[in-house]
């Protein structure tokens, strides 16, 4: 009896694992084995596919074959008993194009209201992704074990921290990798669960902001209790993306070690140009808080996001405010090459009640003022980029008296 060729061959590639699956064409024939050959582009001869010779099952693994993953290859299969079937040729394919990203390795650490997630590729030193190791981004799904309500977080890197969680609560999550450059979305990791700890006695510092004054950076934060000491650490932001580098630790900012106020001042030359992460920790001598949320700090934007300069034209019931470019030392205007929005705060000189206007325009009207009354105005600029949510310090307050009645035209 003539043996029929096997049919419906599927090639599954996950990371560096190459698996072939196929259907027997004749289930009634026993003791059949199967063998594969492969052929590289531009070659005429077929080569025996190691790992896939004389296979009795309908699955084989040819991961040991050292292929150029960017080069097209062709496969063929035949059945063998006393005689052999004709060859069945599989459509040619490029391993890299066909490959799926496997589940990443996930490692969790818990705090009281945060989980630290460390993600690394599932296959160490993968040949398939050798040129893309630093291009992986990850997305995750997280849920409270008790509720099952899922939250998705996209575009994270190899180290990520999720804040604002509940203490003593079990959270579960799964992570998948993506290579956006190749439009590849990976397979989810197994589900990992971790319980957050009891609530820490000391909360972390909050609302960290960086501003520029003279040649210094001023770092400010809020804290619940008095008589504390604080320390501030920094890290290059790009290191979050690099899963293979174990060498970079958070570093102290020398002028911000053991400070007793909720701010510290350090020279601009502490940081070269770049994007950094900053974090703050509080201590009362016996206990230490967990680290604050990390804030992103871009020296380029920070250095040049100066408070706006403005002129006021006073009318009886309003001010017209004209916002200009801030001046550097030497009185040259600073060119802001990114869009800004302006926050204008004004108040009656004799009162503490502040009112606020947010405007994208550089000419702003402050309405509903009383005649012959002194009002004070201060302003600051914000970047409109969500990721680099930066603000200048407020300008000095300028106080002006409104005109007598009937001069509003």
């Amino acid at each position: 009896k003539n043996l029929k060729s096997p049919q419906k061959v599927e090639v599954d590639i996950i990371d560096d694992n190459f698996i072939l699956r196929w259907n027997r064409s004749d289930e009634s024939v026993g003791n059949v084995t199967f063998s594969f050959d492969y052929q590289k582009t531009g070659m005429d001869n077929w080569i025996k596919l190691s790992g896939c010779q004389n296979i009795t099952s309908t699955k084989c693994n040819f991961s040991s074959l050292k292929l150029n993953v960017y080069e097209e290859i062709k496969l063929r299969i035949r059945a063998e008993k006393e005689n052999t079937s004709s060859w069945y040729e599989v459509d040619s394919f490029t391993p890299f194009r066909k490959a799926q990203i496997g589940p990443p390795e996930v490692h969790l650490e818990a705090e009281d209201k945060a989980i630290v997630i460390h993600i690394s590729p599932g296959t160490k030193d993968s040949v398939m992704w050798a040129l893309d190791g630093l291009s992986f981004t990850y997305s995750l799904v997280i849920w409270k074990n008790s509720s099952g309500v899922e939250e998705r977080i996209e575009n994270i890197y190899s180290r990520h921290k999720i804040y604002k969680l509940s203490p003593e609560t079990t959270y579960c999550l799964k992570v998948k990798a993506a290579l956006l450059t190749s439009w590849k979305i990976g397979v989810y990791s197994p589900v990992h669960c971790i319980k957050t700890t009891v609530e820490n006695e000391l909360p972390p510092p909050e609302n960290i902001e960086v501003s520029v004054q003279n040649q210094n950076y001023v770092l400010k934060w809020d804290y619940t209790y008095a008589n504390m000491t604080f320390q501030v650490q920094w890290l290059h932001a790009f290191l979050k993306r690099n899963p293979g580098n174990h060498l970079y630790k958070w570093k102290q900012i020398p002028d911000c070690e053991n400070v007793k106020t909720t701010q510290c001042v350090f020279p601009q030359n502490v940081f070269q140009k770049g994007i950094y992460l900053l974090r703050v920790q509080a201590s009362d001598g016996n206990n230490t808080s967990f680290w604050s949320e990390e804030i992103k700090f871009d020296t380029e934007i920070q250095a040049f996001l100066l408070p706006p300069v403005f002129n006021i034209r006073s009318l009886s019931d309003s001010f017209h405010i004209y916002i200009g470019a801030p001046k550097q030392s030497g009185n040259t205007p600073v060119i802001q090459d990114y869009p800004l929005i302006y926050e204008i705060i004004f108040w009656e000189n004799t009162s503490n009640a502040e009112r606020k206007i947010i405007e994208k325009k550089t000419d702003v009207t402050v309405p509903n003022l009383k005649p012959l009354t002194v009002y004070c105005v201060k302003a600051r600029a914000h970047t409109m980029d969500e990721k680099l949510n930066k603000s200048s310090v407020f300008s000095d307050a300028v106080c002006e008296k409104t005109k007598p009645g009937n001069t509003s035209k």
Epitope: E109, D112, N200, P243, H246, L247, F290
Partner: antibody
Framework: QIQLVQSGPELKKPGETVKISCKAS????????MNWVKQAPGKGLKWMGW????????TYSDDFKGRFAFSLETSASTANLQINNLKDEDAATYFC????????????????WGAGTTVTVSS | DIVMTQSQKFMSTSVGDRVSITCKAS??????VAWYQEKPGQSPKLLIY???NRYTGVPDRFTGSGSGTAFTLTISNMQSEDLADYFC?????????FGAGTKLEVK
């Protein structure tokens, strides 16, 4: 496999200098920080600090600032610990330990240890 | 500095026992705790990291638990080769600190 091979035992007098070496093999030396841990006789383990094997920058724990120096011979995949002006309390076994973490380092535990080098200080 | 306290310096055990070694941190360190085994004349071996994750090649009779300030290493079915010193270590904050150790002895 991954190994850290330390230099042999040392007998020194107070005031002398000792240099201990730790040769790494089986992994890329400049990818992982090297830490040093002290164990005095009958005592527990005490972390001394670490050296960035890529930049050569050392970080010392407060108790080990001054007479202690970490250095590298990168081409030989070797980290060194030098103790100057030896004192009686320096008598201990010193371990080099490679970080076991697979992510940057505010989370550092030790997956690979050297066998330890015993330093005896005696006049 | 964060102090790691192992209150029991010595523990007497027999083969087949279930043994629990405790470690207390002077402040909340989350789950950033590792456990090591040290036998005489040998270097320490990592058993557990992240409070409860077993390191590669460690037998599954070793389990770690706890978070915050209280941590436990449990050996579910004590073997003679498990007679050793056991140390905990916190790695939430620098300087990294170890417990003083608990020595398992034969009853």
């Amino acid at each position: 496999q991954i190994q850290l091979v330390q230099s042999g035992p040392e007998l020194k007098k107070p005031g002398e200098t000792v240099k201990i070496s730790c040769k790494a093999s089986g992994y890329t030396f400049t990818n992982y920080g090297m830490n040093w841990v002290k164990q005095a006789p009958g005592k527990g383990l005490k972390w001394m600090g670490w050296i960035n094997t890529y930049t050569g920058e050392p970080t010392y724990s407060d108790d080990f600032k001054g007479r202690f120096a970490f250095s590298l011979e990168t081409s030989a995949s070797t980290a060194n610990l030098q103790i100057n002006n030896l004192k009686d309390e320096d008598a201990a076994t010193y371990f080099c330990a490679r970080e076991g973490a697979i992510y940057y380092g505010d989370y550092v535990y030790f997956g690979v240890w050297g066998a330890g080098t015993t330093v005896t200080v005696s006049s | 500095d964060i102090v790691m306290t192992q209150s029991q310096k010595f523990m007497s055990t027999s083969v087949g026992d279930r043994v629990s070694i405790t470690c207390k941190a002077s402040q909340n360190v989350g789950t950033a705790v590792a456990w090591y085994q040290e036998k005489p004349g040998q270097s320490p071996k990592l058993l557990i990291y992240s409070a409860s994750n077993r390191y590669t090649g460690v037998p599954d009779r070793f389990t770690g638990s706890g978070s915050g300030t209280a941590f436990t290493l449990t050996i579910s079915n004590m073997q003679s080769e498990d007679l050793a010193d056991y140390f905990c270590q916190q790695y939430y904050n620098y300087p990294l600190t170890f417990g003083a150790g608990t020595k398992l002895e034969v009853k």
